[in-house]
Amino acid sequence: PHLRTFTDHFQTCKVQGAWPLIDNNYLNVQVTNTPVLPGSAATATSKLTIIFKNFQECVDQKVYQAEMDELPSAFADGSKNGGDKHGANSLKITEKVSGQHVEIQAKYIGTTIVVRQVGRYLTFAVRMPEEVVNAVEDRDSQGLYLCLRGCPLNQQIDFQAFRANAESPRRPAAASPSPVVPETFPYETAVAKCKEKLPVEDLYYQACVFDLLTTGDVNFTLAAYYALEDGKMLHSNKDKLHLFERTRELPGAVA
Amino acid sequence: CKILKCNSEFWSATSSGSHAPASDDVPEFCAALRTYALCTRRTARTCRGDLAYHSAVHGIEDLMSQHNCSKDGPTSQPRVRTLPPAGDSQERSDSPEICHYEKSFHKHSAAPNYTHCGLFGD
């Protein structure tokens, strides 16, 4: 999936299986990614588990679990708030669109989470105070906290190289993320479809093009569009909303 | 069981929660505590088997001794905020300040810096 980190780095990751997205003193988010096509290195999120840890007189521990075709509007225990403590309403789930869009507000940690199902796969977005982001007991154990550190270098897909291949008349080589490229989606069509929803040619737009070329699934256009929309709602600095390609930096920075 | 109503009335009467009041606020704090104790006694019949009730009772006892409040004395008219209609266990009235990050954050510094992370697509 495409990852926008807390430090505004944008990466395309092939991380497969279960990975920690956020892991701090208050909250743990784990995603499970699966290949979008047989033999493809590109993966998308098929499962998401969020654990809100027990916190003072505010909330009991609550677990939220979403999977493909199952986006619940309640925690795993059936409740929609933080339990039986006095501050239970400082954690609330709101169903925005049944089966498609859920918002979780954790006021006690100033955090808003948006989970969507777009097509077959899930998207995740969060707004969190820096103080909460950095509230970790053991900094050494935080190496693979994706939202904070990004994907390991060996798990990143070279977005720009793929795009260069796609723009050339040849089809991408077998070494590219998706050997099974659907012939039904020429580069021009992908560009046109993405332009419709994402007029600014930023990294969300580039991600959209990449996804259409990789899968041929137009739902990924919506995934990029909603990711940008959620960013508009959740990002505190509107000037930083659109990310653009930078020249290659240090390893682990923007892919 | 209306123990949560007692809790929220106490929290709103002592707007800084159960943190130590300034010395000149102690009589007012003790009055609010006695009101809280009276409220919990009234809920005893319908809350006596629930944890929230026992937590409140023990909490009151602790605060009473911490602040040297006498059991007898004036009670306060709490500055009650409008509460939502009484509901089931999934519905709660006002949360303590500690359960509202922005409110408690503003107590000790400027507005928090927010960050954003997103994951989507393939």
């Epitope: 225990d77 | 009234r42 019949r45 006596r48 088997g49 629930d50 944890l51």
Partner: antibody, heavy 115, light 112 residues
Framework: EVQLVESGGGLVQPGGSLRLSCAAS????????MNWIRQAPGKGLEWIGM????????HYADSVKGRFTISRDNSKNTLYLQMNSLRAEDTAVYYC????????WGQGTMVTVSS | DVVLTQSPLSLPVTLGQPASISCRSS???????????LEWFQQRPGQSPRLLIY???ERFSGVPDRFSGSGSGTDFTLKISRVEAEDVGVYYC?????????FGQGTKLEIK
């Protein structure tokens, strides 16, 4: 959503014993007092007893005192009713209910005491 | 033990019309500090009881506002402002002021 599911009912002979269970979900079970209530066929409701959230106190109706015991296992989110020395008049649907005073009830389990 | 006596035991009502059920206690249900713990339950045919009203007059969550409770001391009333088909069933009053907790014998509401 609060859910209470009773089980363990069935046919038992007078003088026999039976243990009913009530599996709770959708709320923090260990925070609440719990009740057992019964309803004889075609009759009204009768409160049997209640147990505090931490099992520190139990209260019973006179009709079952000494014969019935309420217990709970908070680690399993389960409430129990141990019924001994059963009589024909104990035949009823047995309900568990959440709270010191009952708000949410289970669907009930039928206990028939007959020879 | 506190005895709760309901009347009438059977209540035929026309759809859309109001209905009223009385519950009388053998002793005052008011505690010394003025609190009264009386509840009303509805039991539809073949279903478990459901809490409607607690503390005499407080509607439980999800209960339509056509249901209301009132009373004090020993006399209590449950009112339905406009009876609907789904209101058919047996209604019980219940007291929690004294141990043992007790129910009224029930009032059966049916549609005329």
């Amino acid at each position: 959503e609060v859910q209470l599911v009773e089980s363990g009912g069935g046919l038992v002979q007078p003088g026999g014993s039976l243990r009913l269970s009530c599996a709770a979900s959708g709320f923090t079970f260990s925070n609440y007092g719990m009740n057992w209530i019964r309803q004889a066929p075609g009759k009204g409701l009768e409160w049997i007893g209640m147990i505090y959230y931490d099992s520190s106190e139990k209260h019973y109706a006179d009709s079952v005192k000494g014969r019935f015991t309420i217990s709970r296992d908070n680690s399993k989110n389960t409430l129990y009713l141990q019924m001994n020395s059963l009589r024909a008049e104990d035949t009823a649907v047995y309900y568990c209910a959440k709270g010191t005073t009952p708000d949410y009830w289970g669907q009930g389990t039928m206990v028939t005491v007959s020879s | 033990d506190v005895v709760l006596t309901q009347s009438p035991l059977s209540l035929p009502v026309t759809l859309g019309q109001p209905a009223s059920i009385s519950c009388r206690s053998s002793q005052s249900l008011e505690e010394s500090d003025g609190y009264t713990f009386l509840e009303w339950f509805q039991q539809r045919p073949g279903q478990s009881p459901r809490l409607l009203i607690y503390d005499v007059s407080e509607r439980f969550s999800g209960v339509p506002d056509r249901f209301s409770g009132s009373g004090s001391g020993t006399d209590f009333t449950l009112k339905i402002s406009r009876v609907e088909a789904e209101d058919v069933g047996v209604y019980y009053c219940f007291q929690a002021t004294y141990d043992p907790l007790t129910f009224g014998q029930g009032t059966k509401l049916e549609i005329k």
